[in-house]
């Protein structure tokens, strides 16, 4: 019947950064296609990526409806050109994904230092508030909107002439730090969600240094 050639998907993996969420799986299809379904624990299954030969499916539109829910996905395998065919048990082969809770598990994207401004011996460093694909009232929410005070930023800063780092923390998107007069400093920020048990830290922002165009210096 052709169904004997159909293999179940395996290695189902969630890839998610700042809520942009893609389900990936194996194997590359040979004479078969896939359809993905997703649901919350208590909800109905919704089909996505119908009869695709891809081995990934973008589920962002579904998970952003409620990022604090826990989601389960499953990948169905069908024989190519005969998608009505079912497996020996009377239904297509499928494999379940691990559970996925976006709020707790989405990776934090690399932050960006928006600007820094020196006024005397103080420097104000501002982190860009990155937009996510989570919506409220037809507006895309920022990372800060979604996580609130659960999200903090760690600033690593150091004199351009040395390598030893100092740190500062904020639960807004701004730091105000003390610096030595006449010294140039470099900055890098990291997003952190301390309440998490996994995926707690982001990769670091690109390093920005005083004396480059992003900053501004004002003598008081």
């Amino acid at each position: 019947s052709g169904t004997t050639n159909t293999v179940a998907a395996y290695n189902l993996t969630w890839k998610s950064t700042n809520f942009k969420t893609i389900l990936e799986w194996e194997p590359k299809p040979v004479n078969q296609v896939y359809t993905v379904q997703i649901s919350t624990k208590s909800g109905d299954w919704k089909s996505k990526c119908f009869y695709t030969t891809d081995t990934e499916c973008d589920l962002t539109d579904e998970i952003v409806k409620d990022v604090k829910q826990t989601y389960l996905a499953r990948v169905f395998s069908y024989p190519a050109g005969n998608v009505e065919s079912t497996g020996s048990a009377g239904e297509p082969l499928y494999e379940n994904s691990p559970e996925f809770t976006p709020y707790l598990e989405t990776n934090l994207g690399q932050p960006t230092i928006q600007s820094f401004e020196q006024v005397g011996t103080k420097v104000n460093v501002t982190v860009e508030d990155e937009r996510t694909l989570v919506r409220r009232n037809n507006t895309f929410l920022s990372l800060r909107d979604v996580f609130g005070k659960d999200l903090i930023y760690t600033l690593y800063y150091w004199k351009s002439s040395s390598s030893g780092k100092k740190t500062a923390k904020t639960n807004t998107n701004e730091f105000l730090i003390d610096v030595d007069k006449g010294e140039n400093y470099c900055f890098s920020v990291q997003a952190v969600i301390p309440s998490r048990t996994v995926n707690r830290k982001s990769t670091d922002s690109p390093v920005e240094c005083m004396g480059q165009e992003k900053g501004e210096f004002r003598e008081i």
Partner: antibody, heavy 121, light 107 residues
């Protein structure tokens, strides 16, 4: 169970070197921050330095800057304190500690048992 | 660097006494203060973080408070196992700094 175990302490001559290890179990060091703290005999606690094992960033107390180097091997879940150009005043029990955040406030919730470093001729 | 001035450096007290230890920061450190207990030959143990939060597993007779740049550790009713040295610590800025310690001895 979360545990930090230091090793590598001992007697060393002034000007000598020593490498201390801080082996972690029960958690992944890259998810946290590791600090080194020392305590001279009969004295209080003195911060030595820190590492963020996730990115390798380090910071040091002025008293050890240029002489001590902190590193981490995430595959071994272990942090290290390389101590060079040792002086008599570096004699102390050395502790590693795990740092976590409560909001923006840091706290050091797990400490190793300490390892004694004696610098003497 | 921020100085943490801890007082008293030592005190004698009896079981059941109420004990208060204070730390004054040389500048604003917000709530970024922790308190640790250390017994001879042992590593420090976290008692209080964020100035007033009791760490998991620590008896409720320990409490912390803040008033501006003054921080207080209170033991409401001293127990035999509480005789130890106590340290405050700020981590508002790098380097993190400790108070000099307060040794609580048996009267």
């Amino acid at each position: 169970e979360v545990q930090l175990v230091e090793s590598g302490g001992g007697l060393v001559q002034p000007g000598g070197s020593l490498r201390l290890s801080c082996a972690a179990s029960g958690f992944t060091i890259a998810d946290y921050w590791i600090h080194w703290v020392r305590q001279a005999p009969g004295k209080g606690l003195e911060w030595v330095g820190f590492i963020d094992p996730y990115n390798g960033y380090t910071g040091y107390a002025d008293s050890v800057k240029g002489r001590f180097t902190i590193s981490a091997d995430n595959s071994k879940n272990t942090a290290y304190l390389q101590m060079n150009s040792l002086r008599a005043e570096d004699t102390a029990v050395y502790y590693c500690a795990r740092a976590d955040y409560h909001g923006v406030d840091e706290y050091w919730d797990y400490w190793g048992q300490g390892t004694l470093v004696t610098v003497s001729s | 660097d921020i100085q943490m001035t801890q007082s008293p450096s030592s005190l004698s007290a009896s079981v059941g006494d109420r004990v208060t230890i204070t730390c004054r920061a040389s500048q604003d450190v917000n709530t970024a203060v922790a308190w640790y207990q250390q017994k001879p030959g042992k590593a420090p143990k976290l008692l209080i973080y964020s100035a007033s939060f009791l760490y998991s597993g620590v008896p409720s007779r320990f409490s912390g408070s803040r008033s501006g740049t003054d921080f207080t550790l209170t033991i409401s009713s001293l127990q035999p196992e509480d005789f130890a040295t106590y340290y405050c610590q700020q981590h508002y800025t790098t380097p993190p700094t400790f108070g000099q310690g307060t040794k609580v001895e048996i009267k």
